[in-house]
Interface confidence: low
Amino acid sequence: STPLMSWPWSPSALRLLQRPPEEPAAHANCHRVALNISFQELGWERWIVYPPSFIFHYCHGGCGLHIPPNLSLPVPGAPPTPAQPYSLLPGAQPCCAALPGTMRPLHVRTTSDGGYSFKYETVPNLLTQHCACI
Amino acid sequence: GLECDGKVNICCKKQFFVSFKDIGWNDWIIAPSGYHANYCEGECPSHIAGTSGSSLSFHSTVINHYRMRGHSPFANLKSCCVPTKLRPMSMLYYDDGQNIIKKDIQNMIVEECGCS
């Protein structure tokens, strides 16, 4: 009689909750951070002509006991974003990272001949949509 | 993605079998009785992140660009060995109303690992 029954999730390991009780959160909680980055900074400006810059998102923060509740449970059609992490695997610590399958491409205009001709391409897996303790 | 073979300590996929009985879920999952969930393990040295073939490659390349130059905020950002590809699995289970449901459940199996 909770979402967990009607939408089963995968347990990824045994040895439930191999952490000391009351382990404090080590860092700020896992969240997505935005940063404006120019292709010039990256040294890609000779290849990528437009846009000159883009909003880059990356995942940052720790995976302590409680993560803010703005991360929702998985429902069909939406990526799962876990809430209360406990490391279950021997020696494994959950890591704040982009959720698999949710990275998006960036559509760019490129040149390979110094600007005489242009192509429209996609830079795959550049934009982070969702972060989670994984 | 690499398979862990005991010879390498860089990020790889480790086989792991989960028994639903062992975690107390056999009262509502009818079949299967367990499955190979797998997990990711290993180190992520800076040259590994962003290697082509990884589904995180361009993203990791951008972060590494700044990380290797010691730029904030990326200087202290740790690269992690995480799932980069997951696979669904078909399951038979009881729902809230004790109805038997057969469903392909997303994200059940770790298929590939990579460095974030």
């Epitope: 009689s1 909770t2 979402p3 967990l4 029954m5 939408w7 089963p8 999730w9 995968s10 347990p11 990824s12 390991a13 439930l16 909750l17 952490r19 009780p21 009351e22 006991l65 409680h66 803010p68 509740p69 703005n70 991360l71 929702s72 449970l73 998985p74 429902v75 799962p80 876990p82 809430a83 209360q84 992490p85 406990y86 490391s87 279950l88 695997l89 494994a92 959950p94 989670a132 303790c133 994984i134 | 975690i23 107390g24 879920w25 009262d27 969930a37 997990y39 799932p83 997951l86 994200n107 059940m108 770790v110």
Partner: antibody
């Protein structure tokens, strides 16, 4: 059908320790957040804390310094101890289950309180 | 901690009428972590709604939940005599798990 039953003394003296036990019957004890919640007479509900069958705990910061929880040896009981009680601790004490799930990465998450005990009234008085 | 404020404190309605109960959070709560409970005198609370909008097993469809972020609503479409009780909202996404102070639905 999972059922919960609280047991323990109905009267505790001030400054003493309140001890209650919750017995779980008819279902699996593993993989859930076994919780204690209390309700002072005529007032609202207050979450005290939870324990997992492995012994991991989380408590309400307002009571943390006085609370301890443990799992019974038979693994179908969990208990609450609240030390240095005062009249303000007079309440109906409920045990409840918050069902849990595990995400694909081995992360346990809580659900709502789907099963409750009937509650036991504890009065703190000399 | 996340403080949940319920309004109104008391709702006086007649059987057959529609009841709308509000629960406001002091900070954003994922809708997946908000529940509603019904409590009658001398009884333990009973789970009505979990995940803000999903009905628990055996709960009649006149009960519905909605909302996201900081504002959540429990609606009882047509009040039955057995629905007069105290209703609590609760969040379980952030520790400490907290309850609202309750809304009493009484017969007018």
């Amino acid at each position: 059908q999972v059922q919960l039953q609280e047991s323990g003394p109905g009267l505790v003296k001030p400054s003493e320790t309140l001890s209650l036990t919750c017995t779980v019957s008819g279902g699996s004890f593993s993989s859930h957040f076994w919780s204690w919640i209390r309700q002072p007479p005529g007032k609202g509900l207050e979450w005290i804390g939870y324990i997992l069958y492995t012994g991991g705990t989380s408590f309400n910061p307002s009571l943390k310094s006085r609370v301890s929880m443990s799992v019974g040896t038979s693994k179908n009981q969990f208990s609450l101890k609240l030390s240095s009680v005062t009249a303000a601790d007079t309440a109906v004490y409920y045990c409840a289950r918050a069902r849990s799930g595990i995400t694909f990465t081995g992360i346990i998450v809580p659900g709502s309180f789907d099963i409750w005990g009937q509650g036991t009234m504890v009065t703190v008085s000399s | 901690e996340i403080v949940l404020t319920q309004s109104p404190g008391t709702l006086s309605l007649s059987p057959g009428e529609r009841a709308t109960l509000s629960c406001r959070a002091s900070q954003s709560v994922s809708s997946s972590y908000l529940a509603w409970y019904q409590q009658k005198p001398g009884q333990a609370p009973r789970l009505l709604i979990y995940g803000a909008s999903s009905r628990a097993t055996g709960i009649p469809d006149r009960f519905s939940g909605s909302g996201s972020g900081t504002d959540f609503t429990l609606t009882i479409s047509r009040l039955e005599p057995e629905d007069f009780a105290v209703y609590y909202c609760q969040q379980y996404g952030s520790s400490p798990w907290t309850f609202g102070q309750g809304t009493k639905v009484e017969i007018k």
